[in-house]
Amino acid sequence: KESTPDVQGQFPCDFSWGVTESVLKPESVASSPQFSDPHLYVWNATGNRLLHRVEGVRLKTRPAQCTDFVNIKKQLEMLARMKVTHYRFALDWASVLPTGNLSAVNRQALRYYRCVVSEGLKLGISAMVTLYYPTHAHLGLPEPLLHADGWLNPSTAEAFQAYAGLCFQELGDLVKLWITINEPNRLSDIYNRSGNDTYGAAHNLLVAHALAWRLYDRQFRPSQRGAVSLSLHADWAEPANPYADSHWRAAERFLQFEIAWFAEPLFKTGDYPAAMREYIASKHRRGLSSSALPRLTEAERRLLKGTVDFCALNHFTTRFVMHEQLAGSRYDSDRDIQFLQDITRLSSPTRLAVIPWGVRKLLRWVRRNYGDMDIYITASGIDDQALEDDRLRKYYLGKYLQEVLKAYLIDKVRIKGYYAFKLAEEKSKPRFGFFTSDFKAKSSIQFYNKVISSRGFPFENSSSRCSQTQENTECTVCLFLVQKKP
């Protein structure tokens, strides 16, 4: 009922075709020392098989190069095969600033990240850099900040601003798209001792983002001319029973608690959504919860309001929801929402339902509520058990991109990019990657390549072309040189 026939058409010429990776752990030393050692060795191949240094001989060395990092070489090979125009990856805050402040800057880590960006640019691949990407097992904070109460401590927001400033300064000449924080609206999974913990941590995350954005706007934008936002987890919600009013209300409430919670203060009013504040207050009045959203001062509202240059959404699936009154003072119970798994739907091994039309509804809802701004889908993908012919991923990509195209062509949503999640999978984690954990390519890569080179799903005889300046053209000489580099 919700699906509409596929459309034929193309995305705009300046559309970003991306792939997302989570945190890149920096290599501490270049893994190819053979070019920086000035000594000559003789290899005793038939005897003890050891290298013996020849004294008194010094060879000319060459300067260290970015591709001395084995990890970078691997990434470049994968990215070159993906044919993407953009690569989204996250820095490791704890590696860059182990002490949590600028007293000890890990220059080697910053050099590594600069190498990732600059080598990508040689392939015609621009970076979208995420400053802070908390993973649920590990908060990704520098140890001293973690031990000082993490995001429950307002000073963490100031520490984040200092870290962001360092990254803007060191990488900003090469990076034009920044994400401050990935999915702050999902940190409720960690700060879940009470609703007040959740809302307090969220408040400090909002402030941290706003401080970083204001710093960029004031100090770096004039020269670097980049754009800064934060990525929100943004699954769509549908009423489990479309004939029940309470389910419709629950679906809207899910969106308010999940997306508007962060979007409203930043994109619109500088304050939390009235619907969310009122719902929590009403439960509080009835003695069903002791939670309360923080009261914002006028100064805080001014600080938060308007601190986004674009809207960044991570969208994976659609959830079917119903109303269920829950007691307790935690974020999950404050929403009064129960999720239903529809077993008739095509789903992944981690039970992510494939519901393509949800992304179009989401984009329409965002546009309707927050205005006609540039929107990037900064992560979207599915786990697929297959190690070679990942048909579920191909189906997912094709259908979800169709719905994004409808949002652009028909709903006139200003969609600027789609970043597939993710580049390579991690061992013993759900298989979201286009490459296996030992870097073997899957067949979905060719599918994504085809969509990228066609700029979507064009008519057979489509004459639509982009001028050279608009379209990202691959430099074959650069590619050749990169592949031949040691």
Partner: antibody, heavy 116, light 107 residues
Framework: EVKFLESGGGLVQPGGSLRLSCAVS????????MSWVRQAPGKGLEWIGE????????NYTPSLKDKFVISRDNAKNTLYLQMSKVRSADTALYYC?????????WGQGTLVTVSA | DIVMTQSPATLSVTPGDRVSLSCRAS??????VYWYQQKSHESPRLLII???QSISGIPSRFSGSGSGSDFTLSINSVEPEDVGVYYC?????????FGGGTKLEIK
């Protein structure tokens, strides 16, 4: 204030050609899709077609695809409709409008009369 | 192409009446219907998007409903300035066809 100002209408002979223009002010023209709609005297509205912000996508109503060409010049904030092989059935008031996605801003229209 | 059929063609009403204008699509178009009002010698004006969502600046007496293939524009308490022709439009897929219009006149 948002303004859409159509021009270029007038009397044209059957089989002839005409280029209509729509000058836009008050919005960031280069960021928006634009449409043409026409209305024959005493009749209803007919959607002609639309063009994307970067001109890479242009959609037409199938019956008019071969005789009308929509284009735009973002530097001049202007939308165009090139009409060719006109017939008396093309006599109408031609409006430019912004689809976002419904047509929320309209010009006053320019009248095209096809007559020998 | 999706055909949009409006009824009635003409509607004569008394100020203060509640009126309903109907629009039927030749196939299901979810909630992709837009309503416009066109007064004599004026350009059309957008009233409702996505079948039921109101537009800022439009009087609250105008409301829309429907989903699938049957849609209704309601005017809660008709005022003399509401005279004109009302059009529905398919916004589901191109070509974005219009209905033939319903002319609203005051008795």
């Amino acid at each position: 204030e948002v303004k859409f100002l159509e021009s270029g209408g007038g009397l044209v002979q059957p089989g002839g050609s005409l280029r209509l223009s729509c000058a836009v002010s008050g919005i960031d023209f280069s960021r928006y899709w634009m449409s043409w709609v026409r209305q024959a005297p005493g009749k209803g509205l007919e959607w002609i077609g639309e063009i994307s912000p970067d001109s890479s996508t242009i959609n037409y109503t199938p019956s008019l695809k071969d005789k009308f060409v929509i284009s735009r010049d973002n530097a001049k904030n202007t939308l165009y409709l090139q009409m060719s092989k006109v017939r008396s059935a093309d006599t109408a008031l031609y409006y430019c409008a912004r689809p976002s996605p419904a047509l929320d801003y309209w010009g006053q229209g320019t009248l095209v009369t096809v007559s020998a | 192409d999706i055909v949009m059929t409006q009824s009635p063609a003409t509607l004569s009403v008394t100020p203060g009446d509640r009126v309903s204008l109907s629009c039927r699509a030749s196939q299901s178009i979810s909630d992709y219907v837009y309503w416009y009002q066109q007064k004599s010698h004026e350009s059309p004006r957008l009233l409702i998007i996505y079948a039921s969502q109101s537009i800022s600046g439009i009087p609250s007496r105008f409301s829309g409903s429907g989903s699938g293939s049957d849609f209704t524009l309601s005017i809660n308490s008709v005022e003399p300035e509401d005279v004109g022709v009302y059009y529905c439009q398919n916004g589901h897929n191109f070509p974005y066809t219009f209905g033939g219009g319903t002319k609203l006149e005051i008795k």
